[in-house]
C-alpha cells in the first residue's frame, strides 16, 4: 500500500508528460585502462569513511586500497567504471558523496575532438631527403585499448611524416575499413592522421589499423576498441542536496535537487501537510501535498522555489524522482525564524537517500 | 540472475475477480518498479501500470483504473494484480516485467468464459 | 497518450540481408525508445534501451537509432533465429505505449 495519504487532489502521475531538461550529472574521473586513479572524499571531518561500487560494498583488495579519505584503484579495467559514492558517519550525522569512474577515453588518442593543435602534426619535408613514414607523435598512440561508453565518439591518431607525404589508410580487424561497415560511415581527417566514429554502437568493437605508408616503405599501429554496454537504471540523486535552509518570516528560499538519469526522469516536491489539525489520516499515513513536479506547465523542476514565506510554510520537503525503472527521494527541512532573528545556514544534513540498489 | 515467476492459467466467469502473483527472485524486489503488460493479439501490448515496492506508489494507465490493482508483499518478494468485474475483453496473456523491462515474467494466460 | 506508430505489420527477408524496422511516437520522446522481440509462445525480450544502448549478452547485429519522433531498429546481418515479432515501446512517459508489432519472416 502507498506509504503516503495525498490530499488537494494531487496525483503521483500527471498525465501530462514531463519535460525534458538538463539533467546534472555526478562529478566523473576519467582513467584510461591500465592506469592508476585516486579519488578522495570530498566530504568534511568525517570519522568514518565507508565505500560502495554500483550501491554494493567496497572492500580493500589486491587492486582496491582505501586510506583514510582516499581510494585508489590500480590498473583500472572497464569493470571498475560506475557510480561510487564516500559516506562519510559522524557523531550526529552521516552525509554521502556520489562521483562516476569512467575506465575510458571518450575521445580516443589522447587528443581535443576539435583537433586544435592536429597542424603540427602534418610534417613537411625538404623534397631532397627521401624518408620513409615514421610517427611524429608517439605520445598520442601510447593508449591501445579503449573502452568507450556507447553513443560516444572515438578518435584514432596515427600522426606521421616521411617524404613524399605518406598515404594513410585504415583496416577493422585487418580488412579494408569501408564506410558502409558502419551505420553513419566515419571521418577520415587525413591532415590530422586520424579516424572518427561518431555514437559508436557495440558493433564497432575490434581493432582498427592505421597504415601509413609512401615508395619507402610502411608503419602501421593498432589500436583496440570496446564498446561499453550500460544497463537502464533508476534516477540517481547527489547527495547533499536538497539541503537544510532556514530563513526569516516574509523572506525567499530555494531548495535544489540535482537529478542523474539516461531515462526521463519526473522530479516531484511534496512537503508533509496537516489535515482537520492532523499530520496522519485513518491509515496512520501521513498527509503529502505535491507543490510542483516537471510537466508541461512547469518550469525548471530541479529547483523549488518559496517566497514570502511563512510559519506555515517550515517543515521537510521532499524530492522525489522517478522514471520507468524506479525511484529516489531525498529530503530538506526548512527553519522559519520570526522577523527579529536574522537567519544563518544550517548545517546541512540531509536525510538519508533512497538508493536501495 | 534475475528471475519473476508468475502464476498459473486460470479459468474463470465473467463478473468474478482473479488475483495473479509475480514472484521476484534474484534481485532488490524493492529498487526497481514492477510492471504489468496486457497482451492480446487484437490490441498488441498494452502497459497496465507499474508499483514501485519499496513505498507502494503505484502508477497506472488511466484505461485499467478501476480494472487493475496492484499490491507488493515485500517479505516474500512477490507483486500481484488483481483484475476486478471481469468480462471476456479480460481474456489475455498478462506479464510482470522488472523496472527496465529487461526481465519479464513467462506470462499468465486469463481466460474468462461463462 | 503517445501512440507509438509500426507502419510495417509485416516484413520479408532472407537470411544474411540486412533490415530496419522503423517506429514513429506521436510526439517528441528524446531518446526514450527501447525495443523488444517477442517468439512464439514467449515473453518479450529486451534488445534496445534509450533508442540505441545494445542490452547485455544481446548480439551486435541488432542495434537502435533515432530521436525525437523517428526511430530505427536495425539487423545488420538477419539469422534464422531472428524469426520474431518486434515491438519498440516510448518509456518518456507514463503510459509507457508500445507500437503495434512488425512481424519478421525469414524468405
Known amino acids: 500500500r502507498p506509504s503516503f495519504s495525498l490530499v488537494e487532489d494531487t496525483t503521483l502521475e500527471p498525465e501530462e508528460p514531463p519535460t525534458k531538461y538538463q539533467i546534472s550529472q555526478p562529478e566523473v574521473y576519467v582513467a584510461a585502462p591500465g592506469e592508476s586513479l585516486e579519488v578522495r572524499c570530498l566530504l568534511k571531518d568525517a570519522a568514518v569513511i565507508s565505500w560502495t561500487k554500483d550501491g554494493v560494498h567496497l572492500g580493500p583488495n589486491n587492486r582496491t586500497v582505501l586510506i583514510g579519505e582516499y581510494l585508489q584503484i590500480k590498473g583500472a579495467t572497464p569493470r571498475d567504471s560506475g557510480l561510487y559514492a564516500c559516506t562519510a558517519s559522524r557523531t550526529v550525522d552521516s552525509e554521502t558523496w556520489y562521483f562516476m569512474v569512467n575506465v575510458t577515453d571518450a575521445i580516443s588518442s589522447g587528443d581535443d575532438e576539435d583537433d586544435t593543435d592536429g597542424a603540427e602534426d602534418f610534417v613537411s619535408e625538404n623534397s631532397n631527403n627521401k624518408r620513409a613514414p615514421y610517427w611524429t607523435n608517439t605520445e598520442k598512440m601510447e593508449k591501445r585499448l579503449h573502452a568507450v561508453p556507447a553513443a560516444n565518439t572515438v578518435k584514432f591518431r596515427c600522426p606521421a611524416g616521411g617524404n613524399p607525404m605518406p598515404t594513410m589508410r585504415w583496416l577493422k580487424n585487418g580488412k579494408e575499413f569501408k564506410q558502409e561497415h558502419r551505420i553513419g560511415g566515419y571521418k577520415v581527417r587525413n591532415q590530422h592522421w586520424s579516424l572518427i566514429m561518431e555514437s559508436v554502437v557495440p558493433s564497432d568493437k575490434g581493432n582498427y589499423t592505421c597504415v601509413v605508408e609512401n615508395e619507402y616503405g610502411s608503419i602501421n599501429h593498432t589500436y583496440h576498441l570496446d564498446v561499453v554496454e550500460r544497463s537502464p537504471h533508476r534516477p540517481i540523486l547527489q547527495a547533499g542536496l536538497p539541503a537544510n535552509a532556514s530563513t526569516v518570516v516574509g523572506g525567499d528560499v530555494e531548495f535544489v535537487c540535482k537529478v542523474y538519469s539516461d531515462a526521463q526522469p519526473h522530479i516531484q516536491w511534496i512537503k508533509h501537510v496537516e489535515k482537520n489539525g492532523s499530520k496522519y489520516g485513518p491509515d496512520g499515513l501521513p498527509y503529502l501535498k505535491v507543490l510542483k513536479h516537471s510537466g508541461i506547465n512547469s518550469s525548471n523542476a530541479e529547483v523549488l522555489a518559496l517566497f514570502n514565506v511563512t510559519e506555515a510554510d517550515a517543515g521537510e520537503y521532499i524530492c522525489k524522482v522517478s522514471n520507468y525503472i524506479g525511484q529516489a527521494n531525498q529530503s530538506a527541512w526548512l527553519t522559519v525564524l520570526p522577523k527579529q532573528q536574522a537567519p544563518g545556514r544550517e548545517k546541512e544534513i540531509t536525510a538519508s537517500p533512497d538508493y536501495l540498489e | 540472475q534475475p528471475y519473476l515467476q508468475q502464476s498459473g492459467a486460470e479459468l474463470v466467469r465473467p463478473g468474478a475477480s482473479v488475483k495473479m502473483s509475480c514472484k521476484a527472485s534474484?534481485?532488490?524486489?524493492?529498487?526497481?518498479?514492477m510492471h504489468w503488460v496486457k497482451q492480446t493479439p487484437r490490441q498488441g501490448l498494452e502497459w497496465i501500470g507499474a508499483?514501485?515496492?519499496?513505498?507502494?506508489?503505484?502508477s497506472y494507465n488511466q484505461k485499467f483504473k478501476g480494472k487493475a490493482t496492484l499490491t507488493v508483499d515485500k517479505s516474500s518478494s512477490t507483486a500481484y494484480m488483481q483484475l476486478s468485474s471481469l468480462t471476456s475483453e479480460d481474456s489475455a496473456v498478462y506479464f510482470c516485467a522488472r523496472g527496465g523491462f529487461d526481465y519479464w515474467g513467462q506470462g499468465t494466460t486469463l481466460t474468462v468464459s461463462s | 497518450d503517445i501512440v507509438m506508430t509500426q507502419s510495417h505489420k509485416f516484413m520479408s527477408t532472407s537470411v544474411g540481408d540486412r533490415v530496419s524496422i522503423t517506429c514513429k511516437a506521436s510526439q517528441d520522446v528524446s531518446t526514450n525508445v527501447a525495443w523488444y522481440q517477442q517468439k512464439p509462445g514467449q515473453s518479450p525480450k529486451l534488445l534496445i534501451f534509450s533508442a540505441s544502448y545494445r542490452y547485455t549478452g544481446v548480439p551486435d547485429r541488432f542495434a537502435g537509432s533515432g530521436s525525437g519522433t523517428d526511430f530505427t531498429f536495425t539487423i545488420s546481418s538477419v539469422q534464422a533465429e531472428d524469426l520474431a515479432v518486434y515491438y519498440c515501446q516510448q518509456h518518456y512517459s507514463s503510459p509507457y505505449t508500445f507500437g503495434g508489432g512488425t512481424k519478421l519472416d525469414i524468405k
Open positions: 508499483i514501485f515496492p519499496e513505498n507502494g506508489d503505484t
Open positions: 534474484g534481485y532488490t524486489f524493492t529498487s526497481y518498479n
